[in-house]
Every structure is written in structure tokens, then in C-alpha cells.
């Protein structure tokens, strides 16, 4: 828990350089995000494909989309879970991180020093050991997050199932209902290829309790979709006299000394004939 208060931002006096004053873990061990580069990567043949169970959410059901002042968050059902880790990890929410229209490079994890346009996090908690995400969040092996790197490219109808509701959650505290859809559609091709490391929440309180799975392959959203994400939302309440745009809501990469990131794939990316043209 913070020493006092819970105010934190991505910019200004309460920005990430100050997080550790109120949230000591933010200056501690196993911090995320990180840069994924060749000299810290090690292939691990035991990293088998994950199975995504209960990810196909019925449109007959309503899921709450919330502007929490830091990101836009979609609540997920507890019977949605990952199979293939040491314990069952049940979903709790997903959210995104992004940049701004003038510098649309707002992913949290970077690959060889390069940012992607945005990043999706699907947060799960260890439901074998803990009753809910809040209890699990400060416990060892408590959380597992799937991270999807997002690049600008073609229109993505699956991501639009979230983005089409942004106008109803423009301000902090606003909530909207989203029809269920297949969350697996938000994941990239070849989900068997991923990076795996032990790290932390990328937002205060920065608990070092996250098993990270960062998918190797990005997904694409269109320039218009990215612009909508970068311009639709505010960090402040509707009646705030000093509105602040929700932009650049990503943490800088953290030191990653004397540790390894394990990959489920060997390093060489195979080029297809189409990819060579």
C-alpha cells in the first residue's frame, strides 16, 4: 500500500520518477516493463503453448468498460482463464497503453530498443491460490499478464469492439457496457511464440508479482483506430476545470541486470517467400 495517498500520473510532479516515494516497490526489484533484446534472451524448450479457455465471451453478456484515470479498462469474467502455467490463472481485466498523435509510440515493452504504437495487457490472477485479483496482486506468483504489442497497419475489427465505446468513457470514472466478444481475437498470430520473464505491475504499486508473457508477434490496428485511442480520453473527471488528455500512459523500460528473458522460440525468424519480396 502507498505510504500516503494514491495520486500518481505519467507526467509532471507525480510522474514515474516520483512513484517510489509513495510506492516503494516501484523503486525495487523485478520492475517492468523492459527492453527485449538479444543478449538477455534464452530459448527454453519447456515453454509450451498456452491455452486460452473461456475467452469467447457471449454478446448476450455485458462487460464493464471503465476510464480509471490512467487507462481504459475492460472487466473480464472469472471463468475466463489461461491453461498451461503452474496454476490456473483467471482473467480479471484488460487495458491498454499508448503514446500521442505526434509520437505514436506508446508500448511499454520495447524490442531491441524500439517502441510499438501501443500495448494491450490482459491481466489474470492465480485463482488456485487466491480468491480475487486484489488479494493475489501482492503475493508471489499472484498475477500473470499477457502483453500484446500493437503496431499501426490495417483496420482491426476486433479491437474496434472496444474502441467503438470510447466516447462513453471519455472522462475519469465513466463506465460503459460492452457486449462480449472473442477476446482471443485480440491476440496475435502464432501465440505459441512468446517472451517470458518475472516482473512487476507497470503501474503503482508496482508489485513484483507478475509472470509476464509478451507475444513475439504484434497485431495491427489502423491509423484511425490508434488516433481514436490517443485522442478520445481524459485523465480527469468531466467537471474538472483543468482537463488532462490521456496520452503517453506508458512507463519507461526498467533496468534488467543479471537476469534472463526466456523465449518459447529460437531466435532466428524464418522468412517466408512473401516476406522476401
Amino acid at each position: 500500500a502507498p505510504v500516503n495517498g494514491s495520486k500518481w500520473t505519467y507526467f509532471g510532479p507525480d510522474g514515474e520518477n516520483s512513484w517510489s516515494k509513495k510506492y516503494p516497490s516501484c523503486g525495487g526489484l523485478l520492475q517492468s516493463p523492459i527492453d527485449l533484446h538479444s543478449d538477455i534472451l534464452q530459448y527454453d524448450a519447456s515453454l509450451t503453448p498456452l491455452e486460452f479457455q473461456g475467452y469467447n465471451l457471449s454478446a448476450n453478456k455485458q462487460f464493464l468498460l471503465t476510464n480509471n484515470g490512467h487507462s481504459v479498462k475492460l472487466n473480464l469474467p472469472s471463468d475466463m482463464h489461461i491453461q498451461g502455467l503452474q496454476s490456473r490463472y483467471s482473467a480479471t481485466q484488460l487495458h491498454l497503453h499508448w503514446g500521442n498523435p505526434n509520437d505514436p509510440h506508446g508500448s511499454e515493452h520495447t524490442v531491441s530498443g524500439q517502441h510499438f504504437a501501443a500495448e494491450l495487457h490482459i491481466v489474470h490472477y492465480n485463482s488456485d491460490l487466491y480468491p480475487d485479483a486484489s488479494t493475489a496482486s501482492n503475493k508471489s506468483e499472484g498475477l500473470a499478464v499477457l502483453a500484446v504489442l500493437i503496431e499501426m497497419g490495417s483496420f482491426n475489427p476486433s479491437y474496434d469492439k472496444i474502441f467503438s465505446h470510447l466516447q462513453h468513457v471519455k472522462y475519469k470514472g465513466q463506465e460503459a457496457f460492452v457486449p462480449g466478444f472473442n477476446i482471443e481475437e485480440l491476440l496475435p498470430e502464432r501465440t505459441a511464440e512468446y517472451y517470458r520473464y518475472r516482473g512487476s505491475l507497470t503501474t503503482p504499486p508496482c508489485n513484483p508479482t507478475v509472470l509476464w508473457t509478451v507475444f513475439r508477434n504484434p497485431v495491427q490496428i489502423s491509423q484511425e483506430q490508434l488516433l481514436a485511442l490517443e485522442t478520445a480520453l481524459y485523465c480527469t473527471h468531466m467537471d474538472d476545470p483543468s482537463p488532462r488528455e490521456m496520452i503517453n500512459n506508458f512507463r519507461q523500460v526498467q533496468k534488467f541486470d543479471e537476469r534472463l528473458v526466456y523465449t518459447s522460440f529460437s531466435q532466428v525468424q524464418v522468412c517466408t517467400a512473401a516476406g522476401l519480396s
Epitope: 457471449s58 453478456k61 471463468d79
Partner: antibody, heavy 121, light 106 residues
């Protein structure tokens, strides 16, 4: 035939609590959320909260958070609404209802007959 | 919360009259739904997604609107139409209903 049937209404003392039941039949119970909506005498409709019977996940109208608890017994195809610290203003007909998705959004296609709760000393 | 204001609260009209009920939302909504309720009964879905009539609803009913202003129109009022009509939005949490418009016989 798809049916929702509420029960448990009646006279409750101020400060007391109520537990209403909503028994469902005629459809696959875990495929739809169950909503509780109330209507004070001569007044409009007010949403209290809902439950996903598949997993017990609940969402409440902020107005009722902390005072209302919705639960489910899947084996009985029944949802429950418990409300505590009742006041005269909680006097209402309480309905359970099921939303269905059609094309672009949901609507409440099935409603129970309602059960009247009167809060009075 | 999105407040839903229906007008009028009640109206008296004769069989054959054209009747218009309006519903104004305090913020923009994607769709408006309408329910009909008769005394002592549960509400019935009547108009879905602003303008789609539920199965069995007579074609003299219509719905229209966008953004914050929506209407339910009865082109030629019939005896079975005397009831209370509620608008409802599902765009924002909490979902909210209008206070109702009671259509009475003149």
C-alpha cells in the same frame, strides 16, 4: 416457455433486510445475466445490479453498492437479491429480468411478474 | 449518470390521435429502447435500438432520434395503446430509464 418468477416480498421493518428469489426456467440458465430492477409506487424503473450465473460475477448500480448483494444458486437456476438497512424509500416492486443481445445492443426480453416489498413500521 | 427526461409526464389523447413522446438524455447515447407497461404488469420491450419494433408491436408505432434526443410516435392511437412508456439507455453505467410517460384516454 422462458419464465422468471420472483418471490420473497412482503412487509419489512425499517432497518431490516430482505432476500428475494428469482427462479428461471425454459432456457440455458448460464447463458444470460440476471438483472434486478425496482419500481417505487407510481414511479419509474431503477436498475439495482446484475449477476452472471455462469461464474457469480456481479455488477451493481453505485447507488446500491454495499447495501445490495446479488448471488446465484446454479443448481436451482435461481438468483437472489439481498438488501440491508432498508428504508421507506426502498418500498417498491422488485423485478428480475433477462437481457438478450440482438444486432447491436441488448434489451430486456423477459421479466418476472415482480414482488412487492413494503418497508414500514 | 446519464439522466433521462421524458416529456410529457402524462398526456390525454383520443383514439385516432397522433401522439409523440420525447426522451432527452443528459449525454449522448448510442441507442434508445422503449418499454410499454400496463398497471399491475411488468414492462414489455416495445421498441429496440431506437427504431426497431419488437415482434408483435403494431406498425403505427415508430421510434427515431440520435445523440441525446429520441422520440416514440403513435400515428393513430388505439384503445390498447393506453399505458405508460419508458425509455432506457444502455450506453453508460448505470443503465437508466426515463421517469415514464402515461398515455391516458381523453
Amino acid at each position: 416457455e422462458v419464465q422468471l418468477v420472483e418471490s420473497g416480498g412482503g412487509l419489512v421493518q425499517p432497518g431490516g433486510s430482505l432476500r428475494l428469489s428469482c427462479a428461471a426456467s425454459g432456457y440455458s440458465y448460464t447463458d444470460y445475466n440476471i438483472y434486478w430492477v425496482r419500481q417505487a409506487p407510481g414511479k419509474g424503473l431503477e436498475w439495482v445490479g446484475y449477476i452472471d450465473p455462469a461464474n457469480g460475477d456481479t455488477t451493481y448500480n453505485q447507488k446500491f453498492k454495499g447495501r445490495a448483494t446479488i448471488s446465484v444458486d446454479k443448481s436451482k437456476n435461481t438468483a437472489y437479491l439481498q438488501m440491508n438497512s432498508l428504508r421507506a424509500e426502498d418500498t417498491a416492486v422488485y423485478y428480475c429480468s433477462r437481457p438478450i443481445y440482438y444486432g447491436a445492443y441488448w434489451y430486456f426480453d423477459v421479466w418476472g411478474q415482480g414482488t412487492l416489498v413494503t418497508v414500514s413500521s | 449518470d446519464i439522466q433521462m427526461t421524458q416529456s410529457p409526464s402524462s398526456l390525454s389523447a383520443s383514439v385516432g390521435d397522433r401522439v409523440t413522446i420525447t426522451c432527452r438524455a443528459s449525454s449522448s447515447v448510442t441507442y434508445m429502447h422503449w418499454y410499454q407497461q400496463k398497471p399491475g404488469k411488468a414492462p414489455k420491450p416495445w421498441i429496440y435500438a431506437t427504431s426497431e419494433l419488437m415482434s408483435g408491436v403494431p406498425s403505427r408505432f415508430s421510434g427515431s432520434g440520435s445523440g441525446t434526443d429520441f422520440t416514440l410516435t403513435i400515428s393513430s392511437l388505439q384503445p390498447e395503446d393506453f399505458a405508460t412508456y419508458y425509455c432506457q439507455q444502455w450506453s453508460s453505467n448505470p443503465l437508466t430509464f426515463g421517469q415514464g410517460t402515461k398515455v391516458e384516454i381523453k
